[in-house]
């Protein structure tokens, strides 16, 4: 999906209002220095591309974040403010359905969410630079 035509201001507002709080809740008990951020993003479409991929693509060490509240809200926000996004997300929906029922938060998932927070913060910063 090409995120170029999203309403970035509306996505920023949704992030600041709800998604950020859910991410921070998920990370509660860990310090921002606990994990080394190894990925970043260049501009707003790039940030959203990587956020979407990291949120919804299962990785070997963290099977799925897609069932988490912040992921559901991210999906809803992108569907709302990115034209045509929801039609491209059949695979992501299937991944959410296949997600493990157990609510165990592994250290690797915490690390992945720490990376996500970094990408979201970069998204906000690139938005501020453009204004």
């Amino acid at each position: 999906y090409d995120f170029t035509n999203c309403d970035f201001q509306k996505i920023e507002a949704d992030y600041l209002r709800t998604i950020s709080k859910d991410l921070i809740t998920y990370m509660s008990g860990t310090k921002s220095t606990d994990f080394n951020n190894t990925v970043s993003c260049s501009n707003r479409p790039h940030c959203l591309t990587e956020i979407q991929s990291l949120t919804f693509n299962p990785t070997p060490r963290c099977a799925s974040l897609a069932k988490e509240m912040f992921a559901r809200k991210t999906k809803a926000t992108l569907a709302l403010w990115c034209p045509g996004y929801s039609e491209t997300q059949i695979n992501a929906t299937q991944a959410m359905k296949k997600a493990r029922k157990s609510k165990v938060t592994t250290n690797k998932c915490l690390e992945q969410v720490s990376q996500l927070l970094g990408l979201w913060r970069r998204f906000i910063r690139t938005l501020l630079k453009k204004q």
Epitope: S40, S42, N43, S53, N57, P60, K129
Partner: antibody, heavy 117, light 108 residues
Framework: QVQLQESGPGLVKPSETLSLTCTVS?????????WSWIRQPPGKGLEWIGY???????SYNPSLKSRVTISRDTSKNQFSLKLSSVTAADTAVYYC??????????WGQGTLVTVSS | EIVMTQSPATLSLSPGERATLSCRAS??????LAWYQQKPGQAPRLLIY???SRATGIPARFSGSGSGTDFTLTISSLEPEDFAVYYC??????????FGQGTKVEIK
Amino acid sequence: QVQLQESGPGLVKPSETLSLTCTVSGYSISSGYGWSWIRQPPGKGLEWIGYISYYGSISYNPSLKSRVTISRDTSKNQFSLKLSSVTAADTAVYYCARTNLLYFDSWGQGTLVTVSS
Amino acid sequence: EIVMTQSPATLSLSPGERATLSCRASQSVSNNLAWYQQKPGQAPRLLIYDASSRATGIPARFSGSGSGTDFTLTISSLEPEDFAVYYCQQYSDWPQYTFGQGTKVEIK
């Protein structure tokens, strides 16, 4: 200390597909970062080809996108480049590199690929 | 595509002298700029990222400055091992990251 090593044929015929592999040691490619390919024609500057991130997102240089495929094999800690329909203009030293998806902090030593019949 | 133009193409200096290399972007890249050093037969090495942050293990004699379209790499006092080609790279314009054509710093 992460180390990267490119391997593959040094000679490819025009119209064929160039295939290279980068073997990474000292760091798991599924643990973090992105894993990129960059090339440098003899005596010329650098050109970014694309990357695959540790979580599987892939990004390509638009000028090469129609011909490029980057993939990975996490069990071997390797990632690969395929460039189809090559011409003499694709003759270059090809580097693999670790990236934070912005810039490139560790590089392989490079491998020269010549396109010639 | 953002075009990166480096000047001069060649800089002839003696060890101990100060080197000032310029990189200009065809449009603003904010501070999304990196500098690399490449010696003959070797891979490039990251020196500077985010326009002014030194990469791990890079000596303090290397410094970067600038923002927007004009950037400078300064080597305060050239050591013999600093004679090489230097490239700038912008990473503001994903997915079209571009490099400058390089500046060669040679011994006078």
